[in-house]
Amino acid sequence: EAHKSEIAHRYNDLGEQHFKGLVLIAFSQYLQKCSYDEHAKLVQEVTDFAKTCVADESAANCDKSLHTLFGDKLCAIPNLRENYGELADCCTKQEPERNECFLQHKDDNPSLPPFERPEAEAMCTSFKENPTTFMGHYLHEVARRHPYFYAPELLYYAEQYNEILTQCCAEADKESCLTPKLDGVKEKALVSSVRQRMKCSSMQKFGERAFKAWAVARLSQTFPNADFAEITKLATDLTKVNKECCHGDLLECADDRAELAKYMCENQATISSKLQTCCDKPLLKKAHCLSEVEHDTMPADLPAIAADFVEDQEVCKNYAEAKDVFLGTFLYEYSRRHPDYSVSLLLRLAKKYEATLEKCCAEANPPACYGTVLAEFQPLVEEPKNLVKTNCDLYEKLGEYGFQNAILVRYTQKAPQVSTPTLVEAARNLGRVGTKCCTLPEDQRLPCVEDYLSAILNRVCLLHEKTPVSEHVTKCCSGSLVERRPCFSALTVDETYVPKEFKAETFTFHSDICTLPEKEKQIKKQTALAELVKHKPKATAEQLKTVMDDFAQFLDTCCKAADKDTCFSTEGPNLVTRCKDALA
């Protein structure tokens, strides 16, 4: 229904706390360089204005769209051109072009320092002094670094953060209480960020239809007892929610997400038997819980899919006269029978099925032609299954760090032109798939591995898009979203690459490395490894292992030495010489 004042409507629906949080996220995602205080001031102004509209919907400007109101606020920021360059040009446009322009200027890799967590005591002090400001800082810092973070989900993580601080700041040993809990939230939030970015990429590059297909497959796996109409309704609603969030319409997105959660909880009988525990929770926890609820038990008595989609003589008639419903039903039926497949794989199979019908239904004897389609799925299914087995075996053998290194070598060979920081970030993230997925039961490994890898590779593509340097990467990134992971997996050593010259300074280290946290140490070593591969792309695994073992030994020795600086300055050049010899 239409509301006289959109801003009053959303304020009433969401309540002041969530309204303010979402406006702060929106501003932080659009203008990523502004300070917290600048954004907090704008948020307060918008909130005060919203309250005047709640009091009187006919008040001046209350009938304006949210994009107009928010855009006007952003464009009124002083020194916009000095700080944001051409983003300021957006302000010369009218809505909806102005909002589109803001969206296009979102930076997936803003040059901001890493979000450093203060030490426990300081954190607890500032949290106790002003919890609202503290949480505002959290929302601002995460949102500006992750401009596509799913806003209602970020509110959920802020709530988690709040609960952890409330609990741990009351304890004697605040540090040991906070660190593992906040690390857990951070890890989950980072995964949530890359997953959501993938959804927005799908929406931006391939439109709502592609996202809806993703949603149908995912929902059919989770709710195999829901019928096709129910799945279609949920997929349509979920598509709307994600379209809004990806489009910067965060208030509408959060409101519609709450509505969807309400609908699901009111219709559990026709959706799933597993929803009750989620539905007993308060709003943010409920929506989060529903988004990752366990799969319902598969219905008994599912007949073979072949009857309707392969053996039927009327397949081509059904396809021609009801294309979307027929293909949608195929995807639904296949997905509900295969919770053990990744969504990417299910979409590849649906695409293969569609292509087969397009070809066969134009032939003289269609049933003979499409009759083998399910057998043709086999290699498509085997490929990711083999990938999971190979990689999980490797992970179990090497552990997370060793596995990351193996991936780093592999990907540096595939795309040596890509910047070392990007390769290291990608390899570290890809390597986490082992810890995340390889410990799961067999039937959960494939969906976990492939859908996670796809999300990470999407980030690789986004970063590469900014400064394209590798034809290999461009080729894989310009194809369809579901084909990316197989495309990257199939890449081999880039034969066109001219090896980098050996620069001694790249492999020169100083004693400051000794005091770095373990994670930073690993990154330094992995940076060196990537550079080695760029110097010798065809180095064997043995050669690289020799060099890296030598390197690790060198660090260990010098970091234990009484005079670290002398050790680094004398042993360092020797290490460089040995490395060159080992790779000669």
Epitope: D227, F228, A229, E230, A269, T270, D301, L302, P303, A304, A306, A307, D308, F309, E311, D312, Q313, E314, K317, N318, E321, A322, V325, F326, T329, Y332, E333
Partner: antibody, heavy 120, light 108 residues
Framework: EVQLVESGGGLVQPGGSLRLSCAAS????????MNWVRQAPGKGLEWIGH???????YYATWAKGRFTISRDNSKNTVYLQMNSLRAEDTAVYFC??????????????WGQGTLVTVSS | FELTQSPSSLSASVGDRVTITCQAS??????LAWYQQKPGQPPKLLIY???DLTSGVPSRFSGSGSGTDFTLTISSLQPEDFATYYC??????????FGGGTKLTVLG
């Protein structure tokens, strides 16, 4: 509760018409191929036709022309329009749900049936 | 296609092993179902895809076959099993066919 309820049966004269309804509850009828099957007194089951999730109707050869299947998703109801009725159309008419959107079988869910008697 | 079910009637005793066959005039792969019907009731699905037992149906019922020849077996007849049995071939959108039925009655 998931169920199908037929209605609209009764006594009709030869040459007359009748529209049977099958109301679904507990599930969305638009997701399934909905079939009509009949059974003459003391005889076997005879498939009439179905309407699938793509709104395409198919009929047994003998039923084409005289029988029409349609549905109203907003009412969650499927219909069987029967014209030029003959004495041999006297039977219990069942509606049955296909296993999926494009399935003619198997039928796990049936209505209780509605009796149509064609007689002068 | 047509389905020929045999026998059309059959008398047996409680505890007997009973077999009903269904023959299709052309191959229908495994797309065959078996139903049980009692007077005044709609049919009840027992077996689908030739050999898959519907949930809730006792394991004494079993189905076999593929292509053109199919069998329903009741390993040890119980009093509640006396009814009429139908096979159904569901080979495609425009063709689903029922067999003529087999009436199973108590011997003597």
């Amino acid at each position: 509760e998931v169920q199908l309820v037929e209605s609209g049966g009764g006594l009709v004269q030869p040459g007359g018409s009748l529209r049977l309804s099958c109301a679904a509850s507990g599930f969305s009828l638009s997701s399934y191929a909905m079939n009509w099957v009949r059974q003459a007194p003391g005889k076997g089951l005879e498939w009439i036709g179905h309407i699938n999730a793509g709104d395409i109707a198919y009929y047994a050869t003998w039923a084409k022309g005289r029988f029409t299947i349609s549905r109203d998703n907003s009412k969650n109801t499927v219909y069987l329009q029967m014209n030029s009725l003959r004495a041999e159309d006297t039977a219990v008419y069942f509606c049955a749900r296909g296993a999926g959107g494009f399935s003619t079988g198997p039928f796990k869910l049936w209505g209780q049936g509605t009796l149509v008697t064609v007689s002068s | 296609f047509e389905l020929t079910q045999s026998p059309s009637s059959l008398s047996a005793s409680v505890g007997d092993r009973v077999t009903i066959t269904c023959q299709a005039s052309e191959s229908i792969n495994s797309r065959l179902a078996w139903y049980q019907q009692k007077p005044g009731q709609p049919p009840k699905l027992l077996i689908y895809d030739a050999s898959d037992l519907t949930s809730g149906v006792p394991s004494r019922f079993s189905g076999s076959g593929s292509g053109t020849d199919f069998t329903l077996t009741i390993s040890s007849l119980q009093p509640e099993d006396f009814a009429t049995y139908y096979c159904q071939g569901y080979g495609g959108s425009s063709t689903t066919t029922f067999g003529g039925g087999t009436k199973l009655t108590v011997l003597g």
